[in-house]
Amino acid sequence: AQGKEVVLLDFAAAGGELGWLTHPYGKGWDLMQNIMNDMPIYMYSVCNVMSGDQDNWLRTNWVYRGEAERIFIELKFTVRDCNSFPGGASSCKETFNLYYAESDLDYGTNFQKRLFTKIDTIAPDEITVSSDFEARHVKLNVEERSVGPLTRKGFYLAFQDIGACVALLSVRVYYKKCPELLQGLAHFPETIAGSDAPSLATVAGTCVDHAVVPPGGEEPRMHCAVDGEWLVPIGQCLCQAGYEKVEDACQACSPGFFKFEASESPCLECPEHTLPSPEGATSCECEEGFFRAPQDPASMPCTRPPSAPHYLTAVGMGAKVELRWTPPQDSGGREDIVYSVTCEQCWPESGECGPCEASVRYSEPPHGLTRTSVTVSDLEPHMNYTFTVEARNGVSGLVTSRSFRTASVSINQTEPPKVRLEGRSTTSLSVSWSIPPPQQSRVWKYEVTYRKKGDSNSYNVRRTEGFSVTLDDLAPDTTYLVQVQALTQEGQGAGSKVHEFQTLSPEGSGNLAV
């Protein structure tokens, strides 16, 4: 922003009525009147170029400083060319000196040169030669100087002539202010420019109505430079929640719009599934049946709990069940769907039912599932199981109703036995197996089927009540295919994998261990 000038003294505007002091009195500087454009103009002039040593002073009236710290002095003047005088006037000069003196009171006509401090020698850029003067075409020079810091109540300026032909047409003394400013929704007051050129005066701004400094943001500050210019803005204000920036002010959000925090963004239209908001709204309330989770941004549509998983199947595999489902048809407008699986078991004989979380094993924790399948194992044969799969999202906790689907399955078969080779010799294989403890009581016997690898025409069967068997009378260094199956009162359980076990070759017959 451009600096503002506050004038303390304006000779040209005073119409010759300032009554400046000349020294020596009646010699040297003289107030003259001229007509220009039918208007009287006043000037102080001096032209003692032929008279040798000159020391003519012109002192302004006492000027009250007020709040100025640095003053600017603008001079408009003409200087005649020394060569335009007869003989070149050996004592003729083409410059004059500018002085100032500070004081707390007006000395009146008491003029003392020693109190004055030289500001500068003022030299013209252009001198007025004879031909210009005769054609009444004078060359006007403009020079500006500044002085500061000033500390007393007022000051004088003085002009010393040392033998020039000078006409002083304008003396304007002013100081500069940084003007009142609205920037970044902050108001900065009119501020007096500082006196030191390198330093900048720091000025705190105040936020306009309904604007605030954002959390963690810097307070608005600007720097007022010596020339009255605002520089280096720091920090800013933002329109508070419920208000948006319109030009240099904060205006309340229109009905149907909202703004949930202090930010540069405009008010946003209320999202889907919300009620129309009043003026100046910071959020929009949800429609009946729709909700906003605590972590949901106000800009997100209101959502609702999902519908139940769309399709649920329970596939029995021995003593395991694989549960599979598809996502709800209605996600409630959210993507944070998770599933929870619960289990109930019922004894067919008594019809008695109860939870079975403690006795079954899930392939992964059954709550907060993101996948759409889970395997449940360690199920007991001849038991009825009901599995419930519930779909939940971020707003499910805000309602009491639940969205779930159930599937029932009867376990009729035992889990396949896990078979191990415990030992071997040239003519025997010692085989053991295991099944989950809950199923063991249901098993009547185990059937071990074995045959030579490559001989698919004949096979042998052994039955046992235990969990191991030694198969004898086998050929050395021969691979046998072995399978174990549980037999229950109701029939066959699931068969194990077909395993390949090899007897020792005769040269390794000393070793019975695996």
Partner: antibody, heavy 130, light 108 residues
């Protein structure tokens, strides 16, 4: 880490014999059954056969549909095994792969016939055209 | 000879779960292995012995096998999972390796 590098003629005329070799780098050559598998363009995988060399004996096993034309042999000094397929026709046009099973064939009496193939050669495209 | 039956194609949206089946008589008594094959590349083993994963294969690949059906499950499917998938068993009656016909997985 075992690596398989395979090579052989890529363009044959009908009735010629296809010949491919697979070199095994790293690992114990005699502990595994080494297989050849092929894949006609745009079709699925077909197992051709396998070989294992233990002691001084080669144990071979071939896909019945190719058995009459296939020979798989080994050169234990170079840790290489080879495939020969005679009397080729356009139907034998395929990418041919050599492959290593995940586990040694038998360990402490537990054997793994038809084990999963965990390492494959880079494949050789063989085209049969007159 | 033993036959493994796979669906020719399966399509699934990103982030969803893909299930590829492999049917065979009493396949539950056999160890089933699964391979992924991308165009122009050799197959890569992703699951062996029904449900075990080789090192370096992500948890999203899992398998199960019971009765007459083995299943490869790929959870949280990504575009990079688009490939052909093959199942494989050893037929103990004929002593031969058998591959399924393959399933093309398309990620929508």
């Amino acid at each position: 880490q075992v690596q398989l590098q395979q090579w052989g003629a890529g363009l044959l005329k009908p009735s010629e014999t296809l010949s491919l070799t697979c070199a095994v780098y790293g690992g114990s050559f005699s502990d595994y059954y080494w297989s050849w598998i092929r894949q006609p363009p745009g079709k699925g995988l077909e197992w051709i056969g396998e070989i294992n060399h233990r002691g001084s004996i080669n144990y071979n096993n071939y896909n019945p549909s190719l058995k009459s034309r296939v020979t798989i042999s080994v050169d234990t000094s170079k840790n290489q095994f080879s495939l020969k397929l005679s009397s080729v026709t356009a139907a034998d046009t395929a990418v041919y792969y050599c492959a290593k099973p995940l586990r040694p064939h038998c360990t402490n009496g537990v054997c793994y016939s038809g084990d999963a193939f965990d390492i494959w050669g880079q494949g050789t495209m063989v085209t049969v055209a007159s | 000879s033993y036959v493994l039956t796979q669906p020719p194609s399966v399509s699934v949206a990103p982030g969803q779960t893909a299930r590829i089946t492999c049917g065979g008589n009493n396949i539950g008594s056999m160890n089933v292995h699964w391979y992924q094959q991308k165009p122009g590349q050799a197959p890569v083993l992703v699951v062996y012995d029904d449900s075990d994963r080789p090192s370096g294969i992500p948890e999203q690949f899992s398998g199960s096998n019971s009765g007459n059906t083995a299943t490869l499950t790929i959870s949280r499917v990504e575009a990079g999972d688009e490939a052909d998938y093959y199942c494989q068993v050893w037929d103990h009656s004929s002593d031969h390796v058998v591959f399924g016909g393959g399933t093309k997985l398309t990620v929508l």
